[in-house]
Every structure is written in C-alpha cells, then in structure tokens.
C-alpha cells in the first residue's frame, strides 16, 4: 500500500513539476526591467526565452519574437536546449510512469517490469528536474552578470550634455517557477526510485539442494536476489533510500530573495 502511495505521489509531484517546467519555458517574464533605484518610466520591459515584450502604462503590450537563431547569445540557446531536454525527458518519463503505476493493470505485466519502468521514469524525472534547474540557474547567472555590468555604466554621457539610460534587468517570475518546478520534478523522480524498490518481486527462496561429497554433508542454500534492480538486500536498501529522500529535501533550496518588480 505504501509503495503504491509513494509511486502515485511521485507521479503526481512529477506531473506538477513538468507542467511547471513547460509553463516556465513558455513564460515571457524570465527577466524583467529593474525598477529599483531607476528613473521611473512609463514603459516596462520584460523578456522570455522566445520573445521580448514591452508594456506601456497605457496598458498596450507589444511582444516581438526572436526571429534569428544564429544572432542569439549562446547562453540563451543553451538555456533553451536545457529546458527543452527537460520537457522531453519529463514527458517520456510521464508516459513510462503511467504504465508503471501499480494501480493500473496492463495485460499480464510482471511486477519486475513495472519496477524497471518505475526506476526508468524516476531517473528521467531526476534528469529532467536537473535540466530545468540548470537552465534557470544559467539564465539567472547571466542576469546577475549583466545587471552589475549595466550598473557599472548605468549612465553614459555624451560630452556631458546628454544622458542615456541603460535598462537593467532582474529576475522574472519564470525563474522562480522554473526553480520550484525543477525541484518538484526532482523530488518526484526520487519518490519513483524509492517506490521501485517495493515493486520488485519478493525473494525467491529455492529449495535447498544437498550435495554429498566424500562423507561430508554440506548444504548450499543460495540467497534470493532482486531481479534486475542491481541493489542488495531489502532492509539495507530501504535505509539508503530513506536517507536519500532526506538528503533531497535538505539539498533543495529556494531563492531567499524574491526580486519581483
């Protein structure tokens, strides 16, 4: 029962996480115009992975797609790639995990096959979550670097006569959505891997076979093994996974400063 709950919860958490990764990837507010310590403008700029937008105080919003591929910064391309890989892996993981769910019966699928599929989807979710977190973090790092660069030369004078204002960008809502979604997908993946252990068939105890050799009676009783999981005994692994679950919770960190503008 606990295994089914863990697997089901892992699936739901991953589903929410992947939906969040898709939402973050599509969102326009990856970077937003920094309003702190800036001249107050009647125009608000924000940018996504696919287009940049301008919202006027009047309410009129205009978005323009990045219609060039070669002219875009390599970092932006890398972030796009990471997010897309995350989505694709996550989607495949979801598909695999649907068939792996213990509550769903498909023909005469053995528990060992379900365990394998659960583990596969779990790993896919973990990699998907890591891709999303990596993508968002790369973009955030890019923003921080550009922010301080533009702060250093915020006003560039032309002969001391005319001042031109450089627009600074800060973290947009999509970054926080991406971080949280990536974390959820990662946690869901870990839960699927934990559930995999309980799904594997129980130890097969073979009948003892006695071998008689020159008056000595030696009985060999081979211990059972978990099919295709590649792990040791059940109790030992349970301890490892419990520890793993705690570690994931501790490692998962959320931004302490929400820099919305």
């Amino acid at each position: 029962m606990a295994v089914t709950a863990c697997q089901g919860l892992g699936f739901v958490v991953s589903l929410i996480g992947i939906a969040g990764i898709i939402a973050a990837t599509c969102m326009d507010q990856w970077s937003t115009q920094d309003l702190y310590n800036n001249p107050v403008t009647a125009v608000f700029n924000y940018q996504g992975l696919w287009r940049s937008c301008v919202r006027e105080s009047s309410g009129f919003t205009e978005c323009r797609g990045y219609f060039t591929l070669l002219g875009l910064p390599a970092m932006l391309q890398a972030v796009r790639a990471l997010m897309i890989v995350g989505i694709v892996l996550g989607a495949i993981g979801l598909l695999v995990s649907i068939f792996a769910l213990k509550c769903i019966r498909i023909g005469s699928m053995e528990d060992s096959a379900k365990a394998n599929m659960t583990l596969t989807s779990g790993i896919m979710f973990i990699v998907s979550g890591l891709c999303a977190i990596a993508g968002v973090s790369v973009f955030a790092n890019m923003l921080v670097t550009n922010f301080w660069m533009s702060t250093a030369n915020m006003y560039t004078g032309m002969g001391g006569m005319v001042q031109t204002v450089q627009t600074r960008y800060t973290f947009g809502a999509a970054l926080f959505v991406g971080w949280v979604a990536g974390g959820l997908t990662l946690i869901g993946g870990v839960m699927m891997c934990i559930a995999c252990r309980g799904l594997a068939p129980e130890e097969t105890n073979y009948k003892a076979v006695s071998y008689h050799a020159s008056g000595h009676s030696v009985a060999y009783k081979p211990g059972g093994f978990k099919a295709s999981t590649g792990f040791g005994s059940n109790t030992k692994n349970k301890k490892i996974y419990d520890g793993g679950a705690r570690t994931e919770d501790e490692v998962q960190s959320y931004p302490s400063k929400h820099d919305y503008v």
């Epitope: 403008t41 700029n45 627009t167």
Partner: antibody
Framework: EVQLKESGPGLVAPSQSLSITCTVS????????VSWIRQPPGKGLEWLGA???????NYNSALMSRLSIRKDNSKSQVFLKMNSLQTDDTAMYYC???????????WGQGTLVTVSA | DIVMTQSPSSLTVTAGEKVTLSCKSS????????????LTWYQQKPGQPPKLLIY???TRESGVPDRFTGSGSGTDFTLTISSVQAEDLAVYYC?????????FGAGTRLEIK
C-alpha cells in the same frame, strides 16, 4: 465615438480644494487610462497625473502632495481632487484618454478653474 | 524631470511652404526593449484642446493629414509639415511619454502670413 467631458466648480477660493469630474463615453475605464493636464491662460501644458486601467496612479512629483486621482468604472467617471489651491493654479483643466505610446489620444473640451478671493 | 526644449518658439510662414519644428529632450526617449521613441506631437488651435498628431516619434495618428511627418531618435526630434495650409495655424507641442513626470515642451507657435 470617444468622448470626455470635464465638469468643475469654475471659481475656487484660495487655500480651498478643487474637485473635477471627467465623464467618459465610447470606451471603458477598465481598458484605458485617463490623464489630467492643465494649461494656465496663455501658457503651456502641464501633466498632473494619470489613473491607469488597473486603478494604479502616477502623479507629477511637484504636485503629488496635494493631488489625488480616483475613478468609478461603473459610472465611467474619473475624479481629480487638488488641495490648497493658490492663484497660480488658475488654468484650463483637461482630461484625456491615454492611447498608444502613452500619448493622449482623445481630449475633453476642458473646464476653466479660476482661483480668486 | 526631463526637460523638453522646442525651437523656434514662434514661426511665421507662407502657405505651401515646408516647415520644420525641432524638439530636444534632456535624456533619450528611446526604449531599448522595442526600439521605439516615446515622443508625441500635439497641435493646439486657438480656443481648442490639443489634438494628437504623432506618437512613437514617427507614427501618424489616424485622420491626421500625411503632410505631417515625425522623425528623429534618442534626444533629437523633428515635426515636418511638407506644405503648410492656412488651417495649420496653431501651437505645436512635443511631449516626453517615457519618463515620469510626462513633460511637455513650451510649444512652437506657427503663424501663417
């Protein structure tokens, strides 16, 4: 057809407050912002402030302390209130609908406010 | 606050002439996000409220005759009337629509001989 019409008291005593109503038709205040502008006789234009579609406001920093703009979407009315009027506040007061580029696309005919004892 | 400087302060021309009105801002009105200049031109005829002519520095408002053309970028802007008509007698104002407070130029008075 977009229309804006200002209605005010005409004459205000010094140190008193001014209240002007701008009644709009042909557009909704939930979709468009409205700005207030004034023009002293024979002089140039001065932006006072604006109330945007979402209800947020911006004011001219020089007048912020004595200026207040609010609106009633259901009645299609925008209200300007200005405190502690002096003689140099005598002007034609206009309300205008904000359009593309934050420009003032449509203007009311204006209401003349004279500050005098 | 952004200072908008218009020149000349007044101008007398004959009908059919080409007229160029200048407007300079103390800071750039060009928004990097959409590469648009947030400068507006208005025409105010005697006894009337101002009328919108040009927004985004060069976009003509619907219904405005095509003899009115806006140009310029950053801090220097121009309103050109290709062939002045008698009905163009008015004061022309430029406005900063980028920075708060939204400021107007002092205006250029156009008179017809």
């Amino acid at each position: 057809e977009v229309q804006l019409k200002e209605s005010g008291p005409g004459l205000v005593a010094p140190s008193q407050s001014l209240s002007i109503t701008c009644t709009v038709s042909g557009f909704s205040l939930t979709n468009y912002g409205v700005s207030w502008i004034r023009q002293p006789p024979g002089k140039g234009l001065e932006w006072l402030g604006a109330i945007w579609a979402g209800g947020n406001t911006n004011y001219n920093s020089a007048l912020m302390s004595r200026l207040s703009i609010r609106k009633d979407n259901s009645k299609s009315q925008v209200f300007l209130k200005m405190n502690s009027l002096q003689t140099d506040d005598t002007a034609m007061y206009y309300c205008a609908r904000v359009g593309y580029g934050n420009s003032f696309a449509n203007w009311g005919q204006g209401t003349l406010v004279t500050v005098s004892a | 606050d952004i200072v908008m400087t218009q020149s000349p302060s007044s101008l007398t021309v004959t009908a059919g002439e080409k007229v160029t009105l200048s407007c300079k801002s103390s800071q750039t009105l060009l928004n990097s996000g959409n590469q648009k200049n947030y400068l507006t031109w208005y025409q105010q005829k005697p006894g009337q409220p101002p009328k919108l002519l040009i927004y985004w520095a060069s976009t003509r408002e619907s219904g405005v005759p095509d003899r009115f053309t806006g140009s310029g970028s950053g801090t220097d802007f121009t309103l050109t009337i290709s062939s002045v008509q008698a009905e163009d007698l008015a004061v022309y104002y430029c406005q900063n629509n980028y920075f708060y407070p939204l400021t107007f130029g002092a205006g250029t008075r156009l008179e017809i001989k």
